[in-house]
Interface confidence: low
Amino acid sequence: GRLVHMTVVSGSNVTLNISESLPENYKQLTWFYTFDQKIVEWDSGKSKYFESKFKGRVRLDPQSGALYISKVQKEDNSTYVMRVLKKDGYEQEWKIKLQVLDPVPKPVIKIEKREDVDDNCYLKLSCVIPGESVNYTWYGELPKEIQNSVLETTLKPHKHSRCYTCQVSNSVSSKNGTFCFSPPCTAARSEQKLISEEDLGGEQKLISEEDLHHHHHH
């Protein structure tokens, strides 16, 4: 049978099913984890759930062959196989490759550099999240969209604060961190503003080099 790919967020409830109808009046249906470990078997009008890490977390719908898994975790990453024994004695097989990703954590925005350069302000910010394979996008008053973890920009003298948002995302979730910067360029840290949870509907973090050295977080 063909292989279907599914990507889901950890902690969610997942339905593994095939897009086509099951063979009519099949004799037996079995779901396997990594090809050889039985999760559940339907036979003679009964579902039998096997001793496995899925016990208590799965439910089979014999009508459609769908396997419901509650609260999936990254350890559930695997290829799942549904094997059906047809009335004629032949077997049919479908495979689903399940990728479970954690929701991305909230990013920390770190001030790497902030200095006056010819009356302009050079700003280097990095968007940090612990060891994840994610996509980065910076938003704000920028000449173009920046799609990596570091933002470098030079600001002409200005009176108003400028805000920069780093969005980290994977295929199942995204989170934002926003840093607002007020002139002058080398102002004390207190004049930099971390947008609050109320402002953006999610908690963001900001740390500067000094913060790192003093183990102090805003």
């Epitope: 009008g45 009964k46 439910r59 089979l60 014999p62």
Partner: antibody, heavy 120, light 109 residues
């Protein structure tokens, strides 16, 4: 029409065994599981286990493991339940019941019940 | 083992009234719950399965609802023949087992 007809009342002494039979008619016997449920006087329903008449496979409630035997005779389209080492609190009406088709363990047709008394 | 708790133990109502019987499971049973009616000297009769499906031949005044741990059997307008004991029942696929609630006696007021 579907019918399950059970054997008559039985009286036993403590420590003895009893056999209750359940004769099916009106459907294909081997297509449906037969369950056994007991009900002590004035009490609720207590599931004992099932037998798959097709294969003879059985499954019992933990409480009855080791004391109950369920068998069937497909030529007589009859299921049997044997309970051994009877105690006074085994006195009850014993029912056989048939599975709802393919549903897994909802009981749509019941026998009339067999009263078993246990006393010395 | 999943325990089913029925309430109230006894319900006293008059014909024509609405009856509401409750069944609570100690852990989720999804929709795998049935209701039975038992009259004195008779075998139980299946009324509702999969929480809300009426069994063959059951009058429309009987309805079931709920999922997870909380279930309700409603008799919209009581007829004299509805006064009986009602049991809820759940099925566990593994280990394969059936358990019944302790029953609710519905009596004429």
């Amino acid at each position: 029409q579907v019918q399950l007809v059970q054997s008559g009342a039985e009286a036993r002494e403590p420590g003895a065994s009893v056999r209750v039979s359940c004769k099916a008619s009106g459907y294909t016997f081997t297509d449906y599981f037969i369950h056994w449920v007991r009900q002590a006087p004035g009490q609720g329903l207590e599931w004992m286990g099932w037998i798959n008449p097709n294969s003879g496979a059985t499954n019992f409630a933990q409480k009855f493991q080791g004391r109950v035997t369920m068998t069937r005779d497909t030529s007589l389209i009859t299921a049997y339940m044997d309970l051994s080492r009877l105690k006074s609190d085994d006195a009850a009406v014993f029912y056989c019941a048939r599975d709802v088709d393919g549903s897994g363990w909802y009981l749509d047709f019941w026998g009339q019940g067999t009263l078993v008394t246990v006393s010395s | 083992e999943i325990v089913l708790t029925q309430s109230p133990a006894t319900l006293s109502l008059s014909p024509g009234e609405r009856a509401t019987l409750s069944c609570r499971a100690s852990q989720s049973v999804s929709i795998y719950l049935a209701w039975y009616q038992q009259k004195p000297g008779q075998a139980p009769r299946l009324l509702i399965y999969d929480a809300s499906n009426r069994a063959t031949g059951i009058p429309a005044r009987f309805s079931g609802s709920g999922s997870g741990t909380d279930f309700t059997l409603t008799i919209s307008r009581l007829e004299p023949e509805d006064f009986a004991v009602y049991y809820c029942q759940q099925r566990s696929d593994w280990p394969p087992s059936i358990t019944f609630g302790q029953g609710t006696r519905l009596e004429i007021k």
